[in-house]
């Protein structure tokens, strides 16, 4: 090779100067006994290149770029031969921005994959390769003492969660959770999180049924649906509470809420609705009094309240 | 300290009838599920039945179905078992068991022997 | 119903070995799997919850591991007090039912 490129930094700061050198050694110098070497930073070529012959024999070409402002562009040395350009060296340049700190990180517990799924903002673009590592440690106190520490979490490329299993996790006991942002201009991270996995638990919510009208059962009075809910099995020794969303099939009406219930409230009268009207209804749940994540809604049931007009409103429920 | 404690147990001829009581301390009683298991002699443990923690959901064994009734008074933070039609296939140390929020039995009483027998 | 299979119903062992008691489920229990210890004569004490979460104050060397349908309870150096039967049991829906017992005994 007849020349060599040698640069301050082969990453930046986006708008950052840079300096790049560029050397043609002896042997090469009968393509022209004064040869003149030119820039090029993508296909512009670059004025300003100050051009020396050095004790060797060799000759130099330095530029000083004031602000590259491509996140990506290959920079290039090149000599007139003829009617072309001969290209001796290019290297690439990339300017971009340290991490940004990831934000919003937030974490659930999911009892059916035995995970802990944590979740993070990770700020604006750095235009570099940006690595993300989920770092935790296991605490016996409020995070201020660190236990062991736990595995790295690192999500696939693009994403910006990432899964704990359960052998790393301890149940019951706080965890230091955190974000580690890295790329070529720097290191951040995010402010810790120390919670107990069960205190984020995320439940499935409940199956709501319509209840199976029974003999002895006082049919519904008018503008009243009656249901019962089926709770999600492997949450059932957990206390919860839930509540009850409805709204008329047609219509641009909004959700009407209804709640707290408890999950052992496995029916219930909701009254106090149109006549004559079919209502979509969802229910969802928390862990509670302690700390938890609401369920997702349950898949809607859809019932309609009977004809008649109702002669009073109100909610009430059977145990 | 978590403490269970087991009584009402005895000799009962079998059709006979028997009510075990469990008396808890140390915790908040009425924020747990609390159940019952039994052990024959010389056998396996055997899940008998559970109560949830404001006695609204009551699941059984078939074995027990129809015959043994599970409550509880939260007031008094005391946990029952009335059997009924008692057999002799019933006869076995009756435990009483505190549950943790994954179904884990994580505190047990010392038991109480029930024996069926004419 | 979802059974539990126990093995082996008994072992024999010395002081300082590894011992390994497996327990199948008859169909997927995610993780709630349990393990218990009770010794003649005495209630069983709550050894490791959730397949893998070791009971307060119980002692490092027990641990449990797998998920799914095949679980293993490991204890890593046997000692004295850990004589005793081993039972697991799936706490995922009712009935909750236990393995038969593994019977740990000294060679």
């Known amino acids: 090779e007849c020349g060599h490129i040698s640069v301050s930094a082969p990453i930046v700061h986006l708008g950052d100067p840079i300096t790049a050198s560029c050397i043609i050694k002896q042997n090469c110098s009968h393509l022209d006994p004064e040869p003149q070497i030119l820039w090029r930073l993508g296909a512009e070529l670059q004025p300003g290149g100050r051009q020396q012959r050095l004790s060797d024999g060799t000759q130099e070409s330095i530029i000083t770029l004031p602000h590259l402002n491509h996140t990506q562009a290959f920079l290039s040395c090149a000599l007139n031969w003829g009617n072309s350009l001969q290209i001796l060296d290019q290297v690439e340049l990339r300017a971009g921005y340290p991490p940004a700190i990831p934000h919003n990180l937030s974490c659930l517990m999911n009892l059916t994959t035995s995970s802990l799924i944590c979740q993070w903002e990770p700020g604006p673009e750095t235009h570099l390769p940006t690595s993300f590592t989920l770092k935790s440690f296991k605490s016996r106190g409020n995070c201020q003492t660190q236990g062991d520490s736990i595995l790295d979490c690192v999500p696939k490329d693009g994403q910006s969660h990432c899964s704990i299993p359960r052998k790393h996790l301890l149940l019951y006991q706080n965890m230091g959770i955190w974000v580690q942002a890295e790329n070529a201009l720097g290191t951040s991270m995010s402010p810790q999180l120390c919670l107990d996995p069960m205190d984020v638990v995320k439940l499935e919510p409940p199956m709501l049924r319509t209840m199976d009208p029974s003999p002895e059962a006082a049919p519904p009075q008018a503008g009243c649906l009656q249901l019962s809910w089926e709770p999600w099995q492997p949450g059932l020794h957990i206390n919860q509470k839930c509540e009850l969303r409805h709204k008329p099939q047609r219509g641009e009406a909004s959700w009407a809420l209804v709640g707290p219930l408890p999950l052992e409230a496995l029916q219930y009268e909701l009254c106090g609705l149109l006549p004559a009207t079919a209502y979509t209804l969802q229910i969802r749940c928390i862990r509670w009094p302690l700390p938890g994540h609401w369920s997702d809604w349950s898949p809607s049931l859809e019932l309609r309240t009977t004809e008649r007009a109702p002669t009073h409103h109100h909610h009430h429920h059977h145990h | 300290e978590v403490q269970l404690l087991e009584s009402g147990g005895g000799l009962v001829q079998p059709g006979g009838s028997l009510r075990l009581s469990c008396a808890a301390s140390?915790?908040?009683?009425?924020?747990?599920?609390m159940g019952w298991v039994r052990q024959a002699p010389g056998k396996g443990l055997e899940w008998v039945s559970s109560i949830s923690s404001s006695g609204g959901v009551t699941p059984y064994a078939d074995s027990v179905k129809g015959r043994f009734t599970i409550s509880r008074d939260n007031s008094k933070n005391t946990l029952y078992l009335q059997m009924n039609s008692l057999r002799a296939e019933d006869t076995a140390v009756y435990y009483c068991?505190?549950?943790?929020?994954?179904?884990?039995?994580?505190?047990w009483g010392q038991g109480t022997l029930v024996t069926v027998s004419s | 119903d979802i059974q539990m299979t126990q093995s082996p119903s008994s072992l024999s062992a010395s002081v300082g070995d590894r011992v390994t008691i497996t327990c199948r489920a008859s169909q997927g229990i995610s993780s709630y799997l349990n393990w218990y210890q009770q010794k003649p004569g005495k209630a069983p004490k709550l050894l490791i919850y959730y397949a893998s979460n070791l009971q307060n104050g119980v002692p490092s060397r027990f641990s449990g591991s797998g998920s799914g349908t095949d679980f293993t309870l490991t204890i890593s150096s046997l000692q004295p007090e850990d004589f005793a039967t081993y039972y697991c049991q799936q706490s995922i829906q009712y009935p909750q039912m236990f393995g038969g017992g593994t019977k740990v005994e000294i060679k």
């Open positions: 068991a505190k549950l943790g929020e994954l179904g884990q039995s994580s505190a």
């Open positions: 140390g915790f908040t009683f009425s924020l747990y599920w």
